[in-house]
């Protein structure tokens, strides 16, 4: 009764398509599948960026994946193939593994990479992202721009760039048609006569940094003797209005009466009748239902009541 | 099995020139960079330079003017011309790959002696 | 220039001791590349622990490495008979790359 033994894939390799992180991960089928034309191999992949604690495990029955990385740090893969149960009579085989690395070769001193890159999606519609130059870089360093997500051809260069003395330090954005909800891939590269630069690399998801306008139309209403209702309208835009989260803060007479945060463009106040002055600012953000992450707005205008009468039913700025 | 061996040194006197190799194998240096580090005798270490894989280089400011480094990729070997040499420029001079923004794997060093 | 700063300068120890070397940069280092390397006479220097905290292959796990910003650390929890020799820090984050000055471990 032989053993029945399976060799690993061949040709296991990481190819870059010039995605700035998008890779991929193909291979070959094993030598000597003959005795198994009846079953249907299944391969186990493991892969991470070089420094992670976890490997992400995928099975198979292709002979490609791909998936995005971190090209500021190494890529590391295994591969093995995997014989079901059904093929072998009994338990399942699985083959020793391929390995295979990945990793651009850098170039310049860490220092010379961009510093503070930041980037930010207003209102859902404009990305904006800028950076520092790196440290004790020249004035003829300049920074270049790339970025690619899936949908486009290939990786294009930012032709709207911010500058400061001459230099590259931000990249204002066309219109991304079908952007979010997928990683945006972005390297960040220079040049110089003097010294070798290297290149950064980052990866977001563009619905995690969008930063929305301010609320518009505050107005008071008075719902009873002692309850006040503040409104106020979502920012004109493609933001829909279940996307939102908002925080008030509300003073009566100067002092900070109350800072809260609701779902839906309303706040009912309960007040006293000795309120001679009650004013809010309200300010929003994209919520856990449309994104993972957000930056807050700035705060709206103030809206402000003063007098004695609290009556009336709107009060506008 | 990754190695470098370094060659080319010797007793030159101030003001002469030497050129050091540092011959790699097991590793391409199409594909990772390779550093000159120094040590005076009984002293700390210095870094020199670096070759990048990609062919640019780094340079320690203070001895950019007197010493330059270069490459041959179909040899696989790194060199470091040494000019207008100074009594303090004597040291074992070292080449090691760079790795990961790491230096992992060091020659055994060649010592250049700088004296009349 | 950044300057690595490590201290002590030499130390003496017997085996089983507990060592700890520091080494203090003169401008914030990012502890991704803050690395040291051990030397014995005669021999080329080698990766001992790089990444602040990662200890290179073949490296004992007596051997530790901790810090941020302008402070690290070398520790050896028991100091083995094999350990005698000196350790560099290095920080290889601005230009010029520079290492400390070294501490020698000797036997007491």
């Known amino acids: 009764d032989t053993e029945i033994k399976v060799n690993p894939p061949q040709d296991f390799e990481i190819v870059d398509p010039g995605y700035l992180g998008y890779l991929y991960l193909q291979w070959q089928p094993p030598l000597s599948l003959d005795h198994f034309k009846e079953c249907t191999v299944e391969y186990e992949l493991k892969y991470r960026n070089i420094g992670s604690e976890t490997w992400k495990t995928i099975i198979t029955k292709n002979l490609h994946y791909k998936d995005g990385f971190d090209l500021n740090k190494g890529i590391e893969a295994k591969i093995h193939t995997l014989l079901p149960w059904q093929c072998t009579n009994g338990s399942e085989v699985q083959s020793s593994w391929a390995e295979t690395t990945y990793w651009i070769s850098p170039q310049g001193i860490p220092e010379t990479k961009v510093q503070d890159m930041d980037c930010v999606y207003y209102n859902w519609q404009y990305l904006l992202c800028s950076w520092k130059p790196g440290i004790g870089v020249l004035l003829d360093t300049n920074y270049n721009l790339f970025y690619w997500y899936e949908g486009l051809d290939h990786a294009l260069q930012c032709v709207d760039y911010i500058k400061a003395d001459g230099q590259n330090i931000g990249c204002r954005f066309p219109y991304l048609e079908a952007s979010d909800y997928k990683d945006f891939y972005i390297c960040v590269n220079g040049s110089s006569e003097n010294k070798p630069i290297r290149s950064s690399y980052f990866t977001f998801q563009l619905q995690n940094i969008v930063k929305p306008l301010p609320p518009v139309y505050l107005t008071f209403t008075r719902e009873s003797s002692c309850e006040i209702k503040l409104k106020w309208s979502i920012p004109l835009g493609p933001i829909p209005a279940r996307c939102f989260d908002y925080e008030i803060e509300i003073r009566e007479d100067d002092t900070t009466l109350v800072t809260a945060t609701v779902e839906n463009e309303t706040y009912t106040l309960k007040t006293t009748n000795e309120t001679r002055q009650l004013c809010f600012v309200v300010r929003s953000k994209v919520n856990i239902y449309c994104s993972d992450d957000g930056i807050w707005s700035e705060w709206s205008d103030k809206q402000c009541w003063e007098g004695e009468d609290l009556s009336k039913k709107t009060l506008l700025r | 099995e990754v190695q470098l061996v370094e060659s080319g040194g010797g007793l030159v006197q101030p003001g002469g020139s030497l050129r050091l190799s540092c011959a790699a194998s097991?590793?391409?240096?199409?594909?990772?960079?390779v550093h000159w580090v120094r040590q005076a005798p009984g002293k700390g270490l210095e870094w020199v330079g670096v070759?990048?894989?990609?062919?640019?280089?780094d340079y320690n400011s203070a001895l950019m003017s007197r010493f330059t480094i270069s490459k041959d990729n179909a040899k696989n070997s790194l060199y470091l011309q040494m000019n207008s040499l100074r009594a303090e420029d004597t040291a074992v001079y070292y080449c090691?790959?760079?790795?990961?923004?790491?230096?992992?794997?060091w020659g055994q060093g060649t010592l250049v002696t700088v004296s009349s | 220039d950044i300057q690595m700063t490590q201290s002590p300068s030499s130390l003496s120890a017997s085996v089983g001791d507990r060592v700890t070397i520091t080494c203090t940069a003169s401008?914030?280092?990012?502890?991704?590349?803050l690395h040291w390397y051990q030397q014995k006479p005669g021999s080329s220097p080698k990766l001992w622990i790089y990444?602040?905290?990662n200890l290179a292959s073949g490296v004992p796990s007596r051997f530790s490495g901790s810090g941020s910003g302008t402070s690290y650390t070398l520790t050896i929890s028991s100091l083995q008979p094999e350990d005698f020799a000196t350790y560099y820090c290095?920080?290889?984050?601005?230009?010029?790359?520079?290492f400390g000055g070294g501490t020698k471990v000797e036997i007491k």
């Open positions: 990444s602040t905290s």
């Open positions: 097991g590793f391409s240096l199409t594909k990772y960079g």
């Open positions: 090691a790959r760079d790795h990961r923004d790491a230096m992992d794997y």
């Open positions: 070759k990048w894989a990609g062919g640019s280089t």
């Open positions: 290095h920080q290889y984050h601005r230009s010029p790359l520079t």
């Open positions: 401008l914030s280092v990012s502890s991704t590349y």
